[in-house]
């Protein structure tokens, strides 16, 4: 069971990143699915290595003082969502903006029907060029 | 099937990074090989988690305006290469240069004879000290 | 065999990061253990994908000129410790400090009784908020 999906620019104002099965994507079988373009949902309980990579372009003066944060989150059936992993990068002083990349990854127990998704502080700063921003998992 | 190879400084002007089976490297068996010191080639079709880490040292004034970009690329038999993953980091203002590290990783389907390699915008900026720059894969 | 442990602030002056089985941690069975809150020790020989993520907050003026470096290290029975992976990030000019995240990961052969741990140049700069700093492994 494995998946690798590709970032998609979205007009939605949500902080949850959108993904698509496009380009050189992976969706090994129907035991993992991309739901609503925003979350990877698994049908089997088990240990999964889950990862995300986010490239963004920001400028210190044009951004809030808070850093750019990417969060890998879990939503299990009947439970509140929780943060699994986070990474933070202070905005660049480069103009108009400076690109930076974040990589998150870890091993987590997922229940049947559990979903994972990626949240960022400012989705408008995310880079969607080929290969820059992606999200995936593999069952151990 | 798994491999982990170590960066090697090169006098070549190519943007493709060079690697070696040295130090604490891994080459599990002959189903994965390091070819010409530049690409990992697999003999078996399947899903692979492929990763690369690149540490580089650059300075904004001494570099081009474009960021430092590391790309993980795929070359399948009889096909042009394609970009699987990329990460970008704006150059540091630190002098003489500021170190930064990039990590790339994802799950991809590889065909028999497929090769993966790592491309960077400026190989002369890459750090080759112990553990700083490496490249590997594992078959799921 | 898999583990994922969560960073813990420590009053110790050691450069070795401290970890805990808390929050959404993983410890699949007793073939991998967290020892002294500082190292993951495996009982079985084999290939492991080992990873660490470290988020830190530093300022160029308040820090030494040397960059912040995170190292993934190996201690095998009867042998000296050795560096497996390292990542480096130059300190931010943001005030009071600028957050940055480092991700390390690679495939390595571990012997029975081998331990892996994470070393940083300045543990006082490490961020221990939910999900920011973690450490784990999985057996292939």
């Amino acid at each position: 069971i494995a998946a690798h999906v590709i970032s998609e620019a979205s007009s939605k104002t949500t902080s949850v990143l959108q993904w698509a099965e496009k380009g050189y994507y992976t969706m090994s079988n129907n035991l993992v699915t991309l739901e609503n373009g925003k979350q990877l949902t698994v049908k089997r309980q088990g240990l999964y290595y889950i990862y995300a990579q986010v490239t963004f372009c920001s400028n210190r003066e044009a951004s809030s003082q808070a850093p750019f944060i990417a969060s890998l989150c879990l939503k299990s059936p009947g439970r509140f969502e929780r943060i699994l992993l986070r990474a933070a990068n202070t905005h660049s002083s480069a103009k108009p903006c400076g690109q930076q990349s974040i990589h998150l990854g870890g091993v987590f127990e997922l229940q049947p029907g559990a979903s994972v998704f990626v949240n960022v502080t400012d989705p408008s700063q995310v880079s969607h060029g080929t290969g820059f921003t992606s999200f995936g998992l593999l069952k151990l | 099937i798994a491999a982990h190879v170590i960066s090697e400084a090169s006098s070549k002007t190519t943007s493709v990074l060079q690697w070696a089976e040295k130090g604490y490297y891994t080459m599990s068996n002959n189903l994965v090989t390091l070819e010409n010191g530049k690409q990992l080639t697999v003999k078996r079709q399947g899903l692979y988690y492929i990763y690369a880490q690149v540490t580089f040292c650059s300075n904004r004034e001494a570099s081009s305006q474009a960021p430092f970009i590391a790309s993980l690329c795929l070359k399948s038999p009889g096909r042009f290469e394609r970009i699987l993953l990329r990460a970008a980091n704006t150059h540091s203002s630190a002098k003489p240069c500021g170190q930064q590290s990039i990590h790339l990783g994802g799950v991809f389907e590889l065909q028999p004879g497929a090769s993966v390699f790592v491309n960077v915008t400026d190989p002369s900026q890459v750090s080759h000290g112990t553990g700083f720059t490496s490249f590997g894969l594992l078959k799921l | 065999i898999a583990a994922h442990v969560i960073s813990e602030a420590s009053s110790k002056t050691t450069s070795v990061l401290q970890w805990a089985e808390k929050g959404y941690y993983t410890m699949s069975n007793n073939l991998v253990t967290l020892e002294n809150g500082k190292q993951l020790t495996v009982k079985r020989q084999g290939l492991y994908y080992i990873y660490a993520q470290v988020t830190f907050c530093s300022n160029r003026e308040a820090s030494s000129q040397a960059p912040f470096i995170a190292s993934l290290c190996l201690k095998s029975p009867g042998r000296f410790e050795r560096i497996l992976l390292r990542a480096a990030n130059t300190h931010s000019s943001a005030k009071p400090c600028g957050q940055q995240s480092i991700h390390l990961g690679g495939v390595f052969e571990l012997q029975p009784g081998a331990s892996v741990f994470v070393n940083v140049t300045d543990p006082s700069q490490v961020s221990h908020g939910t999900g920011f700093t973690s450490f784990g492994l999985l057996k292939l």
Epitope: - | R79, F80, E81, F117 | -
Partner: nanobody, 123 residues
């Protein structure tokens, strides 16, 4: 809108050198193989050289092998052709061409061409 704009042509003596450039816009340059194709006066189109998306692979017609070098700068969205040891038979209009897709290496399906730049080799 895809645009390919060649430059660098001109009059050169036999044995001389020229460097052609092709500035690309309107598409993601780094994803596509690119080629140089030429048309000598009164003749048909002749493929000269191809370069793969990252520049890893280069291919040349036998007639130019060892004399011409194709390269690209993806950060500048520019394709180049360095032409050395030029001969009278290299006289032609040189076009840069974009591949329709990044697929098989034996595919020569171009979907966009530049307007061309004239290279004249004469003493």
């Amino acid at each position: 809108e895809v645009q390919l704009l060649e430059s660098g042509g001109g009059l050169v003596q036999p044995g001389g050198s020229l460097r052609l450039s092709c500035a690309a816009s309107g598409f993601t340059f780094e994803l596509y193989p690119m080629s140089w194709v030429r048309q000598a006066p009164g003749k048909g189109l002749e493929w000269v050289s191809t370069i793969s998306p990252t520049g890893l692979l280069t291919y040349y017609a036998d007639s130019v092998k060892g004399r011409f070098t194709i390269s690209r700068d993806n950060s500048k969205n520019t394709l180049y052709l360095q032409m050395n040891s030029l001969r009278a038979e290299d006289t032609a209009v040189y076009y840069c061409a974009k591949f329709k897709r990044s697929g098989k290496t034996d595919d020569t399906n171009f979907d966009y061409w530049g307007q061309g730049t004239l290279v004249t080799v004469s003493s």
